[in-house]
Amino acid sequence: DSSKWNIEHPGTIYAWEGACVWVPCTYRVLDGALETFILFHNPEYNQNMSKFEGTRLYESTKDGKLPSGQKRVQFLGNKINNNCTLSIHPVHVNDSGQLGLRMVSKTEKWMERIHLNVSERPFPPRIQLPPKLQESQEVTLTCLLNFSCYGYQIQLQWLLEGVPMRQAAVTLTSLSTKSVFTRSELKFSPQWSHHGKIVTCELHDVDGKVLSEDMVQLNVKHTPKLTIEVTPNETTVRKGDSVTMTCKVNSSNPEYTTVSWLKDGIPLKEQNTLMLTLHKVTKSQSGRYCCRVSNDVGPATSEKVFLQVQYAPESSRVQISQSPAVEGSEVNFLCISPANPLPTNYTWYHNGKEVQGRTEKQFQIQKILPWHAGTYSCEAENILGIGERGPGTELDVQYPPKKVTMVIENPTPIREGDTVTLSCNYSSSNPIVNHYEWRPRGAWEEPSLGVLKIQNIGWNNTAVACAACNNWCSWASPVTLNVLYAPRGVRVRKIKPLSEIHSGNSVSLQCDFSSSHPKEVQFFWEKNGSLLGKESQLNFDSISPEDAGSYSCWVNNSIGQTASKAWTLEVLYAPRRLRVSMSQGNQVMEGKTATLICESDANPPVYSYAWFDWNNQSLPYSGRMLRLEPVKVQHSGAYWCQGTNRVGKGHSPLITLTVYYSPQTIGRR
């Protein structure tokens, strides 16, 4: 009953004469254990005897040991691990047929058939290619041989056009119940040049002898392979010549379908054959040419051919590194004149005149100057001729105003308070002068550009400078205005004494002034409107109080005179001219009030008074006023006073006071 038995093996085993076979086999029986195992060669069932007959190659015993007999057949399995693997070594052609595995358990019997195919000669391996080979796309080539046996070593080797392939192949061997094979896998990137080439897989024995082989021709799909040819074979041609370029398709798989031509990467219109002819070439036809050919794989582009059309230099133009250029800077001139071949000689012109010794494409002036301004042009020359001189390029050289000077427009001399007009002049400037600057800065009027009007000029306006300005300012040397003015800073200064003036001192006063233009001056001293002297000093040998007062000095020059502020001369002296006065007269009736006043002339004023009677007896009064109230007859007599200041003392003459009796007193008597 087949449902009770499960036996696994490859089904058919292939080998060749003298090789060996290895039959991987496993079994499983549902009902009990395997008791007997017999290997038949081409078994046939005898109906009469109800048993299988045929050549017995192997028979198991009760103890499971191998019997003596067929040495080339080996049962490699055992009942314990359900293995029924066997090998035949060597194997012969007449071993072809069926191998019958008769299996008997306590209750069940089964015959399993395995096909054995032994050929006379080693059979070839089979090369398996992917459905499509395309250049540079990596694929795996497989060489398969339905054979493998542990007792017989083989090797698969790859060849391309009979030459062993350098790429490393991976060999896989399978000896499983599912399949028995040897397979070699080779990773391979076909190139277009492999198209049509033969790939061989050789089967080698252990000694390296070739036993068999399989061959395939490669069909590598690739884009067209191109070369380009030029006739005449020079790619440097002269303007007006004709040139033919041919695109050769060296290989294409599949056949090419379209052709086009490109110049500098841009397709040429209506050029779709393998030949491109350029008649009477022009300069503009110089460039890099190539052809593009497409097939179903894709487009291919040939290498580029650089076509150089030679021509004489064209009309030149001059490129200037900077214009306007600032004076003193570096300026580079470049002569641009398309030509092929490049010009070998250049001639430079400045304002139409040849610049000697300059024969290169670039002309440099390291420090540009105003006279370098103008039109620069050039001529270029190559083997085909001299180019036309272009119109030239203008160089503008900018510089600060030159030779700036200042002129005083006034008639001289200039007096303080005059209106002075100054003009600022220059010789040249680029760009034009657009403003002026003046030093020192003042609230001055600029009636027109470059003219300065100073109204009411100050005595101290000594020097003025102007600058003419464009992008830069250039300063003129300062002009001294030489303003004439009356003496300034006139003042009275006491030279001696150094301290305060006391009556009798020697006194000197100086008339000072700070400045005068012109320098020549005269002096005048004045007191209360009276002229005192004409020297710079006023001297008093012995000063008296009468000399005190308000003094002024005057200094004059040819422009005018200046007075000092009034200066007060103060003379200090002891009290003098003392006298006693009586407001009510010198005769007073008793009982009334008698007031005596001590009057004095003193500088500084009297600070202390003393009173004395006719006996020079000091009275107990210290004020300026002596008040007797009520006055008595016995107060009659002579009185005097004394005044004191910090300079000294002075006293008055005697004055007599007469006190007479009142009518009441007389009446009483």
Epitope: G328, I365, W371, Y399
Partner: antibody, heavy 124, light 110 residues
Framework: QVTLKESGPGILQPSQTLSLTCSFS??????????VGWIRQPSGKGLEWLAH???????YYNPALKSRLTISKDTSKNQVFLKIANVDTADTATYYC????????????????WGTGTTVTVSA | QAVVTQESALTTSPGETVTLTCRSS?????????ANWVQEKPDHLFTGLIG???NRAPGVPARFSGSLIGDKAALTITGAQTEDEAIYFC?????????FGSGTKVTVLG
């Protein structure tokens, strides 16, 4: 007539600063295209360019000596000065000043007029 | 720093043509080197002859001419005269400084 005259200390000691004056006449350094340069010549040897200054205050120095050199001008006094700091005996030479000019109508400069030189000795 | 090389001495005869050269250690001399030629006569009398490779200074005799010959600057005296006996220095400009050559002593055999 263009003339240039160099003046200097004659003799000085190592590590001192050499001060040279070039007094010129016949041209002005306020004029476009004018410059003055200093060149020296050790006894029996060749010329060595030191520095030059242009009318527009552009200054150029010998790179090997740049850290020690200072060139300046006083346009109003028609003088150009050169200072060489930290002198050594190797600075012993005759020092020349020369006008460098770009004459009218020319595009390049010339060392056209030279002074007669001043001898400087650096000695310990 | 560059080195500027000149012939140490040249001898010529009156009326002959003599060419002095000036080589730069940094490569070919170009117009960008603004070659200057200076003449030194006895008693340290220096005169500028040529500027900007090939321009004669004002007042310099026409027999003096400057040029580039190959990779060198050159000074040619066409029809040398006895008064041309002197030392000739070339100076080359290197973008921001001059370097003088060692000088060529020219002898004009009378």
């Amino acid at each position: 007539q263009v003339t240039l005259k160099e003046s200097g200390p004659g003799i000085l000691q190592p590590s001192q600063t050499l001060s040279l004056t070039c007094s010129f006449s016949g041209f002005s350094l306020s004029t476009s295209g004018m410059g003055v340069g200093w060149i020296r010549q050790p006894s029996g040897k060749g010329l060595e360019w030191l520095a030059h200054i242009w009318w527009d205050d552009d200054e150029y120095y010998n790179p090997a000596l740049k850290s020690r050199l200072t060139i300046s001008k006083d346009t109003s006094k028609n003088q150009v000065f050169l200072k060489i700091a930290n002198v050594d005996t190797a600075d012993t030479a005759t020092y020349y000043c020369a006008r460098i000019s770009i004459p009218y109508g020319y595009y390049d400069w010339f060392f056209d007029v030279w002074g007669t030189g001043t001898t400087v000795t650096v000695s310990a | 720093q560059a080195v500027v090389t000149q012939e140490s001495a040249l001898t010529t005869s009156p009326g002959e043509t003599v060419t002095l050269t000036c080589r730069s250690s940094t490569g070919a001399v170009t117009t960008r080197n603004y070659a200057n030629w200076v003449q030194e006569k006895p008693d340290h009398l220096f005169t500028g002859l040529i500027g900007g490779t090939n321009n004669r200074a004002p007042g310099v005799p026409a027999r003096f001419s400057g040029s580039l010959i190959g990779d060198k600057a050159a000074l040619t005296i066409t029809g040398a005269q006895t008064e041309d006996e002197a030392i000739y220095f070339c100076a080359l400009w290197y973008s921001n400084h001059f370097i003088f050559g060692s000088g060529t002593k020219v002898t004009v055999l009378g």
